[in-house]
Interface confidence: medium
Amino acid sequence: AMHVAQPAVVLASSRGIASFVCEYASPGKATEVRVTVLRQADSQVTEVCAATYMMGNELTFLDDSICTGTFNESRVNLTIQGLRAMDTGLYICKVELMYPPPYYLGIGNGTQIYVIDPEPCPDSD
Amino acid sequence: AMHVAQPAVVLASSRGIASFVCEYASPGKATEVRVTVLRQADSQVTEVCAATYMMGNELTFLDDSICTGTFNESRVNLTIQGLRAMDTGLYICKVELMYPPPYYLGIGNGTQIYVIDPEPCPDSD
């Protein structure tokens, strides 16, 4: 298994955007790396988003994904947007070195993302 | 020492208000209880506010205090207002049974209060 580090706590901005770094210890030079963000809340785990990084290309999530990210050697800078207070939870970074073999899997301990819904702005008269 | 319980984490509202309960295990029926909120950040501890509860009266903080609270048996409901992102930190509840003797002191493990500054509302035209 592969060691994956991520921050313990992150606060989403009042616009519902949270960013954190997911860093992994790689035993070799992978040309294909898959990054998945999982959310754990009430012992339920759901997939938030996933992307595959091919060496030389960008880290690309699906068009309708709430995640964006950049890749720099063994560091993945992740940004999750559109978060609401109800999305507060533990966000786990899962990294897979897909190719070439040997395949390695690493799962972080999770980043607790706290989200506070903003107060609505007063109507302009 | 007296056991004091308080939540591990609390999120301030987008208005900068954070509320939490500080509960203590009292070995007797005290008629005078002093409650102090301390803030720990970067290994520095500062006093945020303090109030003394006299049985039959209300829990009264100073007029210019950022704290308010109510007392119910051995539970203190504390509210801290006017918080900004820079006020994020560990807020420790300290309870002293002042009268009658014997004097008891209890200090909680602290509540991590996270504060996010709101985005400014757009100017009305």
Partner: antibody, heavy 125, light 107 residues
Framework: QVQLKESGPGLVAPSQSLSITCTVS????????LSWVRQPPGKGLEWLGV???????NFHSALISRLTISKDNSKSQVFLELNSLQTDDTATYYC???????????????????WGQGTSVTVSS | DIQMTQSPASLSVSVGETVTITCRAS??????LAWYQQKQGKSPQLLVY???NLADGVPSRFSGSGSGTQYSLKINSLQSEDFGTYFC?????????FGGGTKLEIK
């Protein structure tokens, strides 16, 4: 049940090539890696190399110029070829199923979980 | 390449005793470590994978522990069938090098 069996020449002259075949049953070479390990008489184990489910190979750095590992999935056979033999290549040669993460599995650690009985090779004129 | 240093090289013990064999990696191998047992004239057999997990059919008197660069194999209440040679192997990126081995002999 998982079985592996090595077959080799027994005696090889110095400077010649060694060819050993490992025939497996009970698992598919398209799903698992297969490692080669040797053990000189009275000495410890030396990992030589591995061929993965997709035909990718990794070798011990000291043998990279002399060692070839290939396979025939349809015959469930893996082949080791070691060139330019010297007397210190005299050893028992083992093949071993290399359990662990392959694409799409759910398990994060590697091990050589099943071994053949070994084939003894003597390099001598 | 990652080097594996195993100690002691040999050990003479009696049936019923407890022994501990240690293995040190030259760098962090993140618990990607296996232990094998080899009896005279036989092929090695997997005992422990992922530093702490017992392989199928391995008696519970065997236990693995450790993390980072330091790992150990403990055998409680040694049985006569436990005598032989034990090897550790790292599996954190190739080459998957072995330790030098520990020969366990009956006193």
């Amino acid at each position: 049940q998982v079985q592996l069996k090595e077959s080799g020449p027994g005696l090889v002259a110095p400077s010649q090539s060694l060819s050993i075949t490992c025939t497996v049953s009970g698992f598919s070479l398209t799903s698992y890696g297969l490692s080669w390990v040797r053990q000189p008489p009275g000495k410890g184990l030396e990992w030589l190399g591995v061929i993965w489910y997709d035909g990718n190979t990794n070798f011990h750095s000291a043998l990279i110029s002399r060692l070839t590992i290939s396979k025939d999935n349809s015959k469930s056979q893996v082949f080791l070829e070691l060139n330019s033999l010297q007397t210190d290549d005299t050893a028992t040669y083992y093949c071993a199923k290399t359990e662990g993460h392959y694409y799409g599995s759910n398990y994060g650690y590697y091990a050589l979980d099943y071994w053949g009985q070994g084939t003894s090779v003597t390099v001598s004129s | 390449d990652i080097q594996m240093t195993q100690s002691p090289a040999s050990l003479s013990v009696s049936v019923g005793e407890t022994v501990t064999i240690t293995c040190r990696a030259s760098e962090n191998i993140y618990s990607n470590l296996a232990w094998y047992q080899q009896k005279q004239g036989k092929s090695p057999q997997l005992l422990v994978y992922a530093a702490t997990n017992l392989a199928d059919g391995v008696p519970s008197r065997f236990s693995g522990s450790g993390s980072g660069t330091q790992y150990s194999l403990k055998i409680n209440s040694l049985q006569s069938e436990d005598f032989g040679t034990y090897f550790c192997q790292h599996l954190w990126g190739t080459p998957y090098t072995f330790g030098g081995g520990t020969k366990l002999e009956i006193k």
